[in-house]
């Protein structure tokens, strides 16, 4: 008789999830010499321990604490790049500007990027059929709690000038319900962070509007100012040129507005 299995509204665990996490860990530690000491089997065991045999709507930050300990890493606090709804460009940027870091440039962020996972209460099985959706099922699911935990701690670690890349093509350039808007903004430490600088990325080639005047950006400015952190904003009118100029800053065309 087949065992009854809870049907959730979200997609199931990414196929080959254990192998993927382990392989990513090995690759990361090979690329980053300062992380060579990391025991990837222990990292996987800690990751697995956070959600296996637990109800996937009852996961806590504490469940991930053993994994957090193993993911200890030096991140220059003044070189942090946050992003919202524009992950690919943010990652392209840090691949060129190697001294800056998004969360996904850290071991823990790299391990989990674009993956889904969940288990089932009282069984050691991984659920490959379905996992809880944040809206339709529950917010305390394994994926959401993981990202909330690491995002909060990443923001808490930031200092001096913190940059955030925002998608100027979206109706809400700053979205209070995004991870950036709901977690990271509120966990920047005013005693450590002097300025939050937003980079609003334009989508259309002929779009010359000043998106820093957008009402949602003004809302972000208000939230940040109330937290005694300064706010500045820049339009990136030509993201392709922006990346090109990061690669080749001496190029004569890079002195003009991008």
């Amino acid at each position: 008789v087949p065992r009854w299995r809870q049907q959730w509204s979200g997609p199931g665990t990414t196929k080959r999830f254990p192998e993927t996490v382990l392989a990513r860990c090995v690759k990361y530690t090979e690329i980053h010499p300062e992380m060579r000491h990391v025991d990837c089997q222990s990292v996987w065991d800690a990751f697995k321990g956070a959600f296996i045999s637990k109800h996937p709507c009852n996961i806590t930050e504490e469940d991930y604490q053993p994994l957090m300990k193993l993911g200890t890493q030096t991140v220059p606090c003044n070189k942090i790049l946050l992003w919202s709804r524009i992950k690919d460009l943010a990652h392209q940027f840090t691949q060129v500007q190697r001294d800056m870091f998004t969360l996904e440039d850290t071991l823990l962020g790299y391990l989990a990027d674009d993956l889904t996972w969940c288990g089932e209460f009282n069984t050691s099985k991984i659920n490959y059929q379905s996992c809880p959706d944040w809206r339709k099922d529950c917010s305390n699911n394994p994926v959401s709690v993981f990202w909330k935990t690491v995002s909060r701690r990443f923001a808490e670690a930031a200092c001096d000038v913190v940059h955030v890349m925002l998608n100027g093509s979206r109706s809400k350039i700053f979205d209070k319900n995004s991870t950036f808007g709901s977690v990271e903004v509120h966990n920047l430490q005013p005693e450590k962070v002097q300025t939050l600088e937003a980079w609003v990325i334009h989508g259309g080639r002929e779009d010359s509007r000043d998106l820093c005047q957008d009402p949602t950006i003004k809302e972000l400015e208000s939230i940040i100012s109330k937290r005694n952190i300064q706010f500045s904003c820049k339009n990136i009118y030509r993201p392709d040129k922006f990346l090109q100029c990061v690669k080749n800053p001496e190029d004569s065309s890079c002195t003009s507005e991008i």
């Epitope: 957090m68 300990k69 030096t74 220059p76 850290t106 701690r153 200092c159």
Partner: nanobody
């Protein structure tokens, strides 16, 4: 600006004890959880222990549990690490840092602990 100054390291025989101190300034010390992390020669950063702002909650790496004790004196803006039953593998530069990790940017110079017979 967050500033920390670690002290108390030195050369000690296996089984011996040391007490590390970390004097903090430039921020509201009692509002911040704090951690001790260490870096052994040729190795990466390892989290050792953490403590909440009030001092009421502490946590330890499995490798030091039962041997090390973290504490703080908020009136003196100082963090401590009492290290007992020291082992050769505890040899490292020890840093104190704000936060509970896993992301650290230590501001101090650290203090070297050498355990050797």
């Amino acid at each position: 600006e967050v500033q920390v100054l670690e002290s108390g390291g030195g050369l000690v025989q296996p089984g011996g004890s040391l007490r590390l101190s970390c004097a903090a300034s430039g921020f509201t010390f009692s509002s911040y959880a704090m951690s001790w992390v260490r870096q052994a020669p040729g190795k990466g950063l390892e989290w050792v222990s953490g403590i909440s702002g009030s001092g009421g909650t502490t946590d330890y790496a499995d490798s030091v549990k039962g041997r090390f004790t973290i504490s703080r004196d908020n009136s003196k803006n100082t963090l401590y690490l009492q290290m007992n039953s020291l082992r050769v593998e505890d040899t490292a530069v020890y840093y104190c840092a704000d936060g509970t990790g896993p992301f650290f940017d230590y501001r101090g110079q650290g203090t070297l602990v050498t355990v050797s017979s």
